[in-house]
């Protein structure tokens, strides 16, 4: 299996961004997707049976979806950094994808939405 991600993306301070990963080339069943920041802190979990769990610190600015992705809102400069999606699958095990988000002060911040393999 292969994880495809939105790769390196940039977005405007105060704006929002979609973090998206996609697992391909496997028939494995996705049981859970975990979203984490570079410092090991959790953003959210999407469990196949139980739905979404949003980490308390992000409840007011993380929106579940689209799909297994995550929308991060009201961006601050502190949101710049690495984000990881971890796909828990059966029977393959875990797959991990990386996204780098740069939050820009500039009002002309370009949001790249292309998918790329990290």
């Amino acid at each position: 299996g292969t994880i495809e991600t939105t790769g390196n993306i940039s977005a405007k301070k105060g704006g929002s961004v979609i973090l998206q990963c996609h697992l391909s080339s496997t028939m494995a069943q996705v049981t859970q997707v975990n979203w984490e920041q570079h410092d090991h802190s959790l953003l959210a979990i999407r469990n196949a049976e139980l739905g979404w769990h949003i980490y308390p610190a992000f409840k007011d600015r993380v929106a579940p979806g689209p799909g297994l992705g995550l929308t991060l809102q009201s961006l601050t400069m502190n949101d710049t950094g690495e984000y990881f999606c971890t796909y828990h699958t059966y029977p393959d095990g875990t797959y991990r994808g990386r996204i780098f988000l740069e939050v820009l002060e500039s009002s002309v911040a370009e949001h790249s939405a292309r998918f790329q393999i990290p």
Partner: antibody, heavy 121, light 107 residues
Framework: DVQLQESGPGLVKPSQSLSLTCTVT?????????WNWIRQFPGNKLEWMGY???????SYNPSLKSRISITRDTSKNQFFLQLNSVTTEDTATYYC??????????????WGQGTSVTVSS | DIVMTQSHKFMSTSVGDRVSITCKAS??????VAWYQQKPGQSPKLLIY???YRYTGVPDRFTGSGSGTDFTFTISSVQSEDLAVYYC?????????FGGGTKLEIK
């Protein structure tokens, strides 16, 4: 508040099936909680056995997967544990517990008082 | 499976003392850790979820911290009613697992 009450036989013979019931009051099991079984062995070790979601889908601890079944009866607001081919190693106190996944993840915030099950011939 | 290790089976403390209980995960579990208190003859009671958030009604002398693999549960000023066994649990992925417990004894 949600209240949970376990019931079932306190003594089961080896190779037989263990069947327990958790009766829930104060909340519908079809609402947004997940409904778990946990057991505590002599010596206090805790083991998560599995859950059934509000939609009725179940997830089990792989160590028990071939022997365990968690089902429910929505009309009675009850959910059930069945553990097949028991041995003396299954002697434990069995708890049912619930959680609100969106808010607390897998942290279980309401527990029953537990029921003791001994496996012996 | 992820193994949660509480290295101290027993800890002895006095009323008014500060005490910290540690829990180590065999692999990173982000901040998906809960702490429970189990008093003699009772079922476990949730104290902390998401590593550092106090559950409703839990006194503020109880705190949790940590991320990744190392977690700490602290009682800032131990009271006699805190005599109990304390367990950590992760919910990073199933199967969710518990630590072996730390029994807090009051001198």
């Amino acid at each position: 508040d949600v209240q949970l009450q376990e019931s079932g036989p306190g003594l089961v013979k080896p190779s037989q099936s263990l069947s327990l019931t958790c009766t829930v009051t104060g909340y519908s099991i079809t609402s947004d909680y997940a409904w778990n079984w946990i057991r505590q062995f002599p010596g206090n070790k805790l083991e998560w056995m599995g859950y059934i979601s509000n939609s009725g889908s179940a997830s089990y601890n792989p160590s028990l997967k071939s022997r365990i079944s968690i089902t429910r009866d929505t009309s009675k607001n009850q959910f059930f544990l069945q553990l097949n081919s028991v041995t003396t190693e299954d002697t434990a106190t069995y708890y049912c517990a619930t959680l609100i996944y969106y808010d607390y993840g897998g942290a279980m915030n309401f527990w029953g008082q537990g029921t003791s099950v001994t496996v012996s011939s | 499976d992820i193994v949660m290790t509480q290295s101290h089976k027993f800890m002895s403390t006095s009323v008014g003392d500060r005490v910290s209980i540690t829990c180590k995960a065999s692999q990173g579990v982000s901040t998906t850790v809960a702490w429970y208190q189990q008093k003699p003859g009772q079922s476990p009671k949730l104290l902390i979820y998401s590593a550092s958030y106090r559950y409703t009604g839990v006194p503020d002398r109880f705190t949790g911290s940590g991320s990744g693999t190392d977690f700490t549960f602290t009682i800032s000023s131990v009271q006699s009613e805190d005599l109990a066994v304390y367990y950590c649990q992760h919910y990073y992925s199933t199967p969710w697992t518990f630590g072996g417990g730390t029994k807090l004894e009051i001198k």
